[in-house]
Interface confidence: low
């Protein structure tokens, strides 16, 4: 969902702009840029809106199904464990919850893109907030995982394992609390607006451009740059330590978390680069013209779609990179499918190192 889907005829204050570039009355997507800043009425968005109408519903429907199945499987595997979850597994469970909640909103945004918002202002606020809460939660939880691994391996500080289990729960609660705080603008400014130009209702923000730019910057920094920096810093140090200590098993064990982080970076970087271009246009650092604006709108749709794919990607990564996850998933399916044939199951090793399918600590690691 791209919440910034806007009117066709916009005085889109970058601040406003009736106004922002030269283009002909027939609305050709001219590249002429004006030094006086304000020489024409707003850009049409027919192309980007038609693109959204065709592209987003199909993508969101697919991601909804994949995300629900995949993250449901992850949650099921983790919750089926008899032993207490490790810190990383707890974070991964919360991550699966965040991803599931995010994909649950996608059908609503699919309807919004295809037709209009038919669910009222209340659900618009909730869906928008839920969407952003889980967008931020996904990024912050990945940062938490990397920080946990960093303390665990680089400083040999098992922050969560030795201490009370409440510590990891408190961290997760803090993450969710922070995400709720970040989503406050959604509760306040999102509502179902009847767009007279399109003769349709859409779930959109209605606040000054300054606020919108601030929100985009917050999303860029808190939801992407900061978590990415934390991840990069932590994993760089972890890899350095593991390479020096020649801990091959632990290097193998690191594979999953590294792949998850790389996936996060690959999935979300394009979208945030587009958002950065948008911010620069809002701030006037990049000249706004109709051609560029239209391309940015379409790029935002495509790259946000790529970003939301990340919600479905984690379960696939666990399945293909995480040996233990595949094993436990298989066992769970067997248990669900053949309740009276438990003797057929390959019993998991009872060793301590099997306590987690993602952990990479001194006390516990798995050959992922």
């Amino acid at each position: 969902m791209v919440l910034e889907v806007s009117d066709h005829q916009v005085l889109n204050d970058a601040e406003v702009a009736a106004l922002l570039e030269n283009f002909s009355s027939s609305y050709d997507y001219g590249e002429n840029e004006s030094d006086s800043c304000c020489t024409s009425p707003p850009c049409p968005q027919d192309f980007s809106l038609n693109f959204d109408r065709a592209f987003l519903p199909a993508l969101y429907s697919l991601l909804f199904l994949l995300g629900l199945l995949g993250n449901g499987a992850v949650a099921a595997v983790l919750l089926s464990r008899r032993t207490a979850l490790s810190s990383t597994d707890t974070f991964l469970l919360h991550l699966a919850v965040a991803d599931t909640l995010l994909v649950l909103t996608l059908p609503l945004w699919a309807v919004d893109a295809a037709v209009q918002w038919v669910f009222g202002s209340g659900l618009c606020k909730v869906a928008g907030a839920l969407f952003n809460i889980n967008f931020y939660a996904g990024a912050l939880l990945l940062a938490c995982i990397s920080f946990d691994r960093y303390l665990n391996i680089v400083h040999a500080t098992q922050l969560y394992r030795r201490g009370p289990p409440a510590r990891v729960t408190l961290t997760c609660l803090a993450v969710w609390g922070l995400c709720l705080l970040f989503a406050l603008p959604d509760f306040i400014f999102l509502s179902a607006h009847h767009d007279e130009r399109l003769n349709a209702t859409h779930c959109q923000y209605n606040f000054p451009q300054v606020g919108r730019t601030a929100l985009r910057v917050l999303q860029l920094v808190a939801g992407f740059l900061l978590p990415l920096l934390v991840m990069a810093y932590c994993y760089a140090h972890i890899l350095a330590v593991l390479l020096v200590s020649r801990g091959q098993r632990r290097l193998r064990a690191m594979r999953l978390v590294v792949v998850v982080v790389v996936a996060f970076a690959l999935c979300w970087t394009p979208y945030h680069l587009v958002v950065l271009v948008d911010i620069l246009m809002d701030l006037g650092a990049l000249a706004r013209n109709c051609g560029r604006e239209s391309r940015v709108d379409v790029a935002k749709s495509v790259t946000s779609g790529l970003g939301y794919m990340h919600c479905c990607l984690n379960p696939l990564l666990y399945a293909f990179v995480g040996v233990k996850f595949r094993e436990r998933m298989w066992m769970l399916l067997l248990r669900l499918g053949c309740p009276n044939q438990r003797g057929l199951q390959r019993q998991p090793s009872s060793s301590r190192r099997d306590s987690s399918w993602s952990e990479t600590s001194e006390a516990s690691y798995s050959g992922l």
């Epitope: 204050d13 406003v16 009736a18 009425p41 300054v210």
Partner: antibody
């Protein structure tokens, strides 16, 4: 209730200057783009200036470019039009008008108008 | 600049008449906006995006058209409808208005 109240009009000699004000109330002034539109006696409407909601962007038609300056003081909820090098053809009723907003975006027509202030340029 | 030409400039009609005012653009516009103005008063937004009636505008008013030609129609003229009507475009800068159509009682 949305209200726009213009003031500052009067009689001025050709080449002279005048500053019009428009006090806005009943809506969040900082969120709206605003314009000045004029109407010469017995004539039609002519749009003369627009300013973005934050005041960053302004635009004028060729007929007033370089002579008129639109500005706003968001703290005072007031729109201004500084008119310099006035000519006889600038004689008109000057209206301040608000651009409507939909979905956080602004439209190029006008949903609310003030009652106008008369500017007469004559020697 | 896009020139908007309204016809007729003056129109005498009686209460109950069906009246049509035309607005022609010198080059194609996407939408037309109509305003009503009564003597000594400020203009009021009447029709926007070609066919949408502004709040409080009676349903006897309608707008239509595309490209270069747009019309405002009053299905059954009422005493309060006698006023001057202006069309406006903002497809291309500068925003321009038509010369107006003065609707008078016959």
């Amino acid at each position: 209730e949305v209200q726009l109240l213009e003031s500052g009009g009067g009689l001025v000699q050709p080449g002279g200057s005048l500053r019009l004000s428009c006090a806005a109330s009943g809506f969040t002034f900082t969120s709206y783009a605003m314009s000045w539109v004029r109407q010469a006696p017995g004539k039609g409407l002519e749009w003369v200036a627009v300013i973005s909601h934050g005041g960053t962007y302004t635009y004028y038609p060729d007929s007033v470019k370089g002579r008129f300056t639109i500005s706003r003081d968001n703290a005072k909820n007031t729109l201004y039009l500084q008119m310099n090098s006035l000519r006889a053809e600038d004689t008109a009723m000057y209206y301040c008008a608000r651009h409507p907003i939909y979905s956080g975006n602004y439209q190029g027509y006008f949903d609310y108008w003030g009652q106008g202030t008369l500017v007469t340029v004559s020697s | 600049d896009i020139q908007l030409t309204q016809s007729p400039s003056f129109l005498s009609a009686s209460v109950g008449d069906r009246v049509t005012i035309t607005c022609r653009a010198s080059s194609g516009v996407n939408y037309i906006y109509w305003y009503q103005q009564k003597p000594g008063k400020a203009p009021k937004l009447w029709i926007y995006f070609t066919s949408n009636l502004a709040p409080g505008v009676p349903s006897r008013f309608s707008g239509s058209g595309s490209g270069n030609e747009y019309t405002l129609t009053i299905s059954s003229l009422q005493p309060e409808d006698f006023a001057t009507y202006y069309c406006q475009q903002f497809t291309s800068s500068p925003y321009t208005f038509g010369g107006g159509t003065k609707l008078e009682i016959k």
